[in-house]
């Protein structure tokens, strides 16, 4: 019983890590940028894997996306492959583990075929989510070293050769999301590990015994009752991105409760 | 069509306060922020300060921080503009003005004149 | 606060000329996560509110007429005039829309000679 909850339980768990590393993998607000210190300005921007957004007081925003390879930063390509990476070995490792599940029957599966896919999703939840966190780090580091860099920039004499203001970034929401939805894919595939180890079946040194009474016989064999609970997570499908077929996004976004103004 | 719709002229003592409405129409007034901007006789324009009708945050300029205060009314769908402490250098025709793209004004109150004399 | 100051104060200009006005800001309206500059021009007719005419510096408003034009970048820019019209006579303020507080030029008399 605690095998299957310990299953079901790192199943869980990685399925919500894996929804979140793909949301955060799509969220815009990978950067943003930094309002303290500085002056404050009517306009917001924020930078994410795949475009990069400005947010006017007016409500009105609008999104560009790098319709560039070659002119983007090793670092931002990278980070997008671990993003993948990480989904992508995530996928399979859920769709793995659903035939893993104890509570599942599938056939006449052997306990030791679902121990054995139960430590490959696990492992797969455990590289998924490692390539998850190492993005997202990667992303963090490479913020940080920028932003020391601008701030240098500011308090260095440039002259009237600057033509823009210093737009300095920082840690944007999707960063954190990130973070914690790999902790959780990691979490869930150590999980799976564990529930493994469970799954295995131990060789046993009897044979089934008979025991004869009279009037009527029973056979009675170890090893118990297979659960037949329909162990099932019934969670809606959310759209989490729209990537669209626009070549440029302008949307009037209307102020909302939360934005500034 | 957009249209804002200003109250009417009024004539006040130094160190009293005044309040302006300005009822907009034509479009959702929670989806635009109001922005108030004055103007002195024979002067140019002075931004005062905008509020986001949907939230109610406001944004003032620090030179009338403390004596302009802008709200909204949603059920009315009215923005007011309350200046206190006024003097004789407030005389002036106050405006509220829709932000649009670009925090531009796109669409503006006919004026309301506001005088100060004792 | 910004400071935007407008040259000349007042242009006179034969109908059929062209009329350019200078706007010049104390720090770069140039916004680098999109590249825009933040830069309104507006026309004011006496005794009516101000009329916006092209935003982002050289982004015409609907229904304006294609003989006004903006341009600059950073913290210089120009409204110009192609053709002068007897209507076109107004005040035109340049304002800064990035910075808080929003600050306006201090006009620019457009008269016939």
């Known amino acids: 019983m605690a095998v299957t909850a310990c299953q079901g339980l790192g199943f869980v768990v990685s399925l919500i890590g894996i929804a979140g590393i793909i949301a955060a993998t799509c969220m815009d607000q990978w950067s943003t940028q930094d309002l303290y210190n500085n002056p404050v300005t009517a306009v917001f921007n924020y930078q994410g894997l795949w475009r990069s957004c400005v947010r006017e007081s007016s409500g009105f925003t609008e999104c560009r996306g790098y319709f560039t390879l070659l002119g983007l930063p090793a670092m931002l390509q990278a980070v997008r492959a671990l993003m993948i990476v990480g989904i992508v070995l995530g996928a399979i490792g859920l769709l793995v583990s659903i035939f893993a599940l104890k509570c599942i029957r599938i056939g006449s599966m052997e306990d030791s075929a679902k121990a054995n896919m139960t430590l490959t999703s696990g492992i797969m939840f455990i590289v998924s989510g490692l390539c998850a966190i190492a993005g997202v780090s990667v992303f963090a580091n490479m913020l940080v070293t920028n932003f020391w860099m601008s701030t240098a920039n500011m308090y260095t004499g440039m002259g009237g050769m600057v033509q823009t203001v210093q737009t300095r970034y920082t840690f944007g929401a999707a960063l954190f999301v990130g973070w914690v939805a790999g902790g959780l894919t990691l979490i869930g595939g150590v999980m799976m590990c564990i529930a493994c180890r469970g799954l295995a079946p131990e060789e046993t040194n009897y044979k089934a015994v008979s025991y004869h009474a009279s009037g009527h016989s029973v056979a009675y064999k170890p090893g118990g009752f297979k659960a037949s609970t329909g162990f099932g997570s019934n969670t809606k499908n959310k759209k989490i991105y729209d990537g669209g077929a626009r070549t440029e996004d302008e949307v009037q976004s209307y102020p909302s409760k939360h934005d500034y103004v | 069509q957009v249209q804002l719709v200003q109250s009417g002229a009024e004539v006040k003592k130094p160190g009293s306060s005044v309040k302006v409405s300005c009822k907009p129409s034509?479009?959702?007034?929670?989806?635009?922020?109001i922005d108030w901007v004055r103007q002195a006789p024979g002067q140019g324009l002075e931004w005062m300060g905008g509020?986001?009708?949907?939230?109610?945050?406001?944004v003032y300029n620090e030179k009338f921080q403390g004596r302009v205060t802008i709200t909204a009314d949603e059920s009315t769908s009215t923005a007011y503009m309350e200046l206190s402490s006024l003097r004789s250098e407030d005389t002036a025709v106050y405006f509220c003005?829709?932000?649009?793209?670009?925090?531009?004004?796109?669409?503006w109150g006919q004026g309301t004149l506001v005088t100060v004399s004792s | 606060d910004i400071v935007m100051t407008q040259s000349p104060d007042s242009l006179a200009v034969s109908l059929g000329e062209r009329a350019t006005i200078n706007c010049k800001s104390s720090?770069?309206?140039?916004?680098?996560?999109?590249?825009?500059?933040?830069l309104t021009w507006y026309q004011q007719k006496p005794g009516q509110p101000p009329k916006l005419l092209i935003y982002?510096?050289?982004t015409r408003e609907s229904g304006v007429p294609d003989r006004f034009s903006g341009s600059g970048s950073g913290k210089d820019f120009t409204l110009t005039i192609s053709s002068l019209q007897a209507e076109d006579v107004a005040v035109y303020y340049c304002q800064n829309n990035y910075f808080y507080p929003l600050t306006f030029g201090g006009g620019t008399k457009v008269e016939i000679k």
């Open positions: 720090q770069s309206l140039l916004n680098s996560g999109n590249q825009k500059n933040y």
């Open positions: 034509g479009y959702t007034f929670t989806n635009y922020l």
């Open positions: 509020i986001n009708p949907g939230s109610g945050d406001t």
């Open positions: 003005a829709r932000r649009v793209r670009g925090n531009s004004f796109d669409s």
């Open positions: 982002w510096a050289s």
